[in-house]
């Protein structure tokens, strides 16, 4: 077990920023509670990539090309308070990637592709208090999607394409009720209803035709 | 590891404001939460608001809310907590501190001692 | 808010004893109890997070454990150093909450 040459390690934290890794490092020190990766040139995350860390509290890869993330990733990460993934490449969120992060409080998803969100993505989140989802390619957002989030404070869902039909009413809904959505969240379409904020429109114009 | 320094010691008349500062040295802190947490002489330890600097949006406790306004610079790596309205009960000692998530608070600045008397 | 009771408020030891401090939650918050150590003058030091884990470079004299509303924090054997308040802190739901604290004087 070692620290990687080009980076630094110190009271568990493993710090290697800015160092253009392509991969994540291996066989560090299962002791550690915080891996910091910004700013490197990383495409994938590996299967079980973390597991064997399994106290960590924080993981930061934000800023890498990540366009793959496998289903295991994170598994079993039972103490993670925050995950960092704001701009990278990421298209979807594969099924159970969030599995088990019951510790999880920050989720950082912004400035990335993703065009979809599964129904049970966040199921286990039950503790977040922060999720960002600002600056993707969402549509739109399937009903009972944030149900898990009972510990919600703060939403980021601005700077995504919504369709702002009948699919989205729930949404207007749920914003209405919860006024967490903090960054502005506005509809792209139908035309009537383009450039208005989500959380600010009567649920009855959300239509289908 | 990320470390702490806030300003100095102020002294203030009631109703006035003032503005803490808490500078991150050895480590950047645009993605981490920043909290404050003041302590009145002899008192124990009050949690008053946090911001996730590269977001700008905080988050604050009702105690103080419309009082107190957290900003973050992120071009200097500074926090700041801004109280207006100050009564002789707001002399305390005010912390920032950083963590993992919202509500842990791993490293914590020196203090800044802020007095409220006429 | 989750109201935090310490007991008890103070207490005096002798080097090498065992100290047991307690903390409950006025309602259940797992195991989302974070403790620290606080000295004259000093900002708090991180102790221990979730309950049980300890936070680098923290003696293992030190430890905690419970879940739910009933936690404890134990020294096996009192150091000078460890001559300070402590407190735990509640990090389930907003606002984070602290207990009053508990003085460990010498006797």
């Known amino acids: 077990l070692h620290c990687p040459a080009a980076c630094t390690c110190s009271n568990n934290i493993v710090d290697c920023r800015g160092k253009g890794l392509t991969e994540i490092p291996t066989n560090l020190p299962e002791t550690i509670t915080e891996i910091r990766l910004e700013q490197n040139t990383i495409k994938v995350i590996p299967p079980g990539a973390f597991s064997p860390y399994k106290k960590l509290r924080r993981i930061d890869l934000s800023n890498n090309q990540i366009s793959e993330l496998a289903p295991d990733a994170f598994q079993g990460l039972r103490s993670l308070n925050s995950l960092v993934l704001y701009g990278n490449k990421i298209t979807e969120l594969p099924k159970s990637l969030f599995e088990g992060l019951f510790s999880l409080q920050l989720l950082l998803l912004n400035a990335n592709k993703i065009n979809c969100l599964r129904v049970d993505a966040f199921q286990d989140l039950h503790n977040l208090n922060l999720l960002s989802l600002y600056d993707n390619k969402l549509q739109t957002i399937a009903k009972g999607t944030f149900s898990p989030l009972r510990a919600i404070q703060t939403m980021h869902l601005a700077q995504n394409p919504f369709i702002c039909d009948c699919h989205l009413k729930w949404l207007a809904d749920y914003l209405h009720t919860n006024p967490i959505e903090t960054s502005g969240a506005r509809c792209t379409s139908p035309r009537r209803l383009a450039n208005k904020r989500i959380g600010q429109i009567k649920s009855k114009k959300f239509r289908c035709s | 590891q990320v470390q702490l320094v806030q300003s100095g010691a102020e002294v203030k008349q009631p109703g006035s404001s003032v503005k803490v500062s808490c500078k991150a040295s050895?480590?950047?802190?645009?993605?981490?939460?920043v909290s404050w947490v003041r302590q009145a002489p002899g008192q124990g330890l009050e949690w008053m608001g946090g911001i996730i600097p590269i977001f700008g949006t905080a988050n604050y406790a009702q105690k103080f809310q419309g009082r107190v306004t957290i900003t973050a610079d992120e071009s200097t790596d500074t926090v700041y907590m801004d109280l207006s309205s100050l009564k002789s009960e707001d002399t305390a000692v005010y912390y920032c501190?950083?963590?993992?998530?919202?509500?842990?608070?791993?490293?914590w600045g020196q203090g800044t001692l802020v007095t409220v008397s006429s | 808010d989750i109201q935090m009771t310490q007991s008890p408020s103070s207490l005096s030891a002798s080097i090498g004893d065992r100290v047991t401090i307690t903390c409950r939650a006025s309602q259940n918050i797992n195991a989302y109890l974070n403790w620290y150590q606080q000295k004259p003058g000093k900002a708090p030091k991180f102790l221990i997070y979730a309950a049980s884990n300890l936070q680098s470079g923290v003696p293992s004299r030190f430890s905690g454990s419970g879940s739910g509303t009933d936690f404890t924090l134990t020294i096996s054997s009192l150091q000078p150093e460890d001559f300070a308040i402590y407190y735990c802190?509640?990090?389930?739901?907003?606002?984070?909450?602290f207990g009053g604290g508990t003085t460990v004087e010498i006797k």
């Open positions: 501190a950083t963590g993992s998530g919202w509500y842990t608070f791993d490293y």
């Open positions: 050895g480590g950047s802190f645009r993605s981490y939460t």
């Open positions: 802190q509640q990090s389930y739901r907003s606002p984070p909450t």
